[in-house]
Amino acid sequence: IWELKKDVYVVELDWYPDAPGEMVVLTCDTPEEDGITWTLDQSSEVLGSGKTLTIQVKEFGDAGQYTCHKGGEVLSHSLLLLHKKEDGIWSTDILKDQKEPKNKTFLRCEAKNYSGRFTCWWLTTISTDLTFSVKSSRGSSDPQGVTCGAATLSAERVRGDNKEYEYSVECQEDSACPAAEESLPIEVMVDAVHKLKYENYTSSFFIRDIIKPDPPKNLQLKPLKNSRQVEVSWEYPDTWSTPHSYFSLTFCVQVQGKSKREKKDRVFTDKTSATVICRKNASISVRAQDRYYSSSWSEWASVPCS
Amino acid sequence: RAVPGGSSPAWTQCQQLSQKLCTLAWSAHPLVGHMDLREEGDEETTNDVPHIQCGDGCDPQGLRDNSQFCLQRIHQGLIFYEKLLGSDIFTGEPSLLPDSPVGQLHASLLGLSQLLQPEGHHWETQQIPSLSPSQPWQRLLLRFKILRSLQAFVAVAARVFAHGAATLSP
């Protein structure tokens, strides 16, 4: 058993039918010694008396808010949550496996630049009685600070019969060094509590591996005289690290016909313009990637040829 | 060329070669990007590689003030990785494919280190740790980790030279 926060405790249980469970001793936070009684949740049934209460925690029915009273007055509370370990594996019932980029990916994170700011998100089908708490650091043995905000519900979607809820959190490394080569990964830890179930999820990454630039901005076409060719130009996204002479991007320019089956013409360039042939009803799209490190491409920015 | 006395390197040549290094490092093992090698006991392997750290002056401001600190750090790293790529980690079993870009990568590391420091001038270099994995699968894992680390190192070096070529070239 360990303390998650003040008056909230997590009991770690080997989880199988008829498991012996864990013996837990609760102590009433009071100088009083006599006349103390204990109850669980809203029930008025007295579970025991005295300054300490010993319970055998086996199932969710044994978890909840234990309260010690004296003469009708509440003295203190202890909330017991359960953390299930099945066959040596901690339960992951609360969050959905996003399966990208690999199985057992519960947390996904992205950064728009090298500033040390990043966003993580996760999915669940649970809509109520759900709380998240996020902590992060650079490295784990001698951790350096990363400050995370509160997790918020960022999207809701319908997937078949189920509703899916997306939560996200923004974090910022306290003393980021954008130009340095990272040697210690960022660690992100999410505590999830659903009713009386506790779970924790972790992710470990380098900022360089989660970089995904915003799409190029101000995408424009300039027809070239007496030609089917056009000059496409664009700019670095505002959110990208500066100076651009140091934090450089490379670009992919694509000409795509109306039909998905039509052959796509692609050009790669380090410049912020390119000359391409604009077919009727086609569109031109441009996306960006770090020039020197193969992290994710941005989403496409597009304009119609006409 | 960057000499210990402090003259400027051939920024544009360094830029071209460092960008080539980036391409080679990723083609040497493109799938490394999809392997979570940090799950595989890192301790004794890539902890000793030289990293370009915050105080090494490789940021745009540091390069403007005095690029020598940064260039020396880059040179150290290039020599370190050049030795690693020439060691039995890469020459031993399992053999690299004949068309593997590791050979080109090795040669380019040497080429860039010589651009930074011609013969006759010496910056101190870092000792290469004695990594001699016994099993072929350990060697394979170590190659992945070294290439992964090299990808990060050459990316920073390439940024330095691109910025230098754009803003510090005479």
Partner: antibody
Framework: EVQLLESGGGLVQPGGSLRLSCAAS????????MSWVRQAPGKGLEWVSS????????DYADSVKGRFTISRDNSKNTLYLQMNSLRAEDTAVYYC?????????WGQGTLVTVSS | DIQMTQSPGTLSLSPGDRATLSCRAS???????LAWYQQKPGQAPRLLIF???TRATGIPDRFSGSGSATDFTLTISSLEPEDFAVYYC?????????FGPGTKVDIK
Amino acid sequence: EVQLLESGGGLVQPGGSLRLSCAASGFTFSNYSMSWVRQAPGKGLEWVSSIRSSGGRTDYADSVKGRFTISRDNSKNTLYLQMNSLRAEDTAVYYCATGIAVARYWGQGTLVTVSS
Amino acid sequence: DIQMTQSPGTLSLSPGDRATLSCRASQSVGSDYLAWYQQKPGQAPRLLIFAASTRATGIPDRFSGSGSATDFTLTISSLEPEDFAVYYCQQYGSSPATFGPGTKVDIK
């Protein structure tokens, strides 16, 4: 006392389908992960599939992936295995068991024979 | 997938003898995620040991498990008549969980 009782086995032609059920009692079924394990006649044990307590996560052996579907109805305390595109090599006694992988409690098994 | 091998295939012993059954994994089994089961003819298997050395509920203390990484052992200190059966090891540290082919302990 934990009890698991499988049903739904029988003779089926190759390419056919069968749905196995496992009725659970003696424990809070909805709280626990469940699995199916099979044993070909005279052969060893093979883990087939498992499902978490809520039904939200399922896992399959490569040999049955895409053909078998594990599911559960917590309101009925019942575990299911829907088997489609059956092959001769699926002939086995199918056991339902508690747990993701470590089978602490087992049913008595139901025999599935795939033959023309 | 992790392959499990068991030796010997058959062990012929008398009641009161000590039985030592071996199980080997093709690669390391993380955190000693290894279980042993006993199966008698016409019956479902029964869990004996999990986490390499922890006895399951109701299993007599003549059964003990040991080992780590790739090499594991099940020891029956003094065979009782009801112990003659087939014994399977199973790794569950890596998905999918895989069983060994079994060791048959029969009466000499």
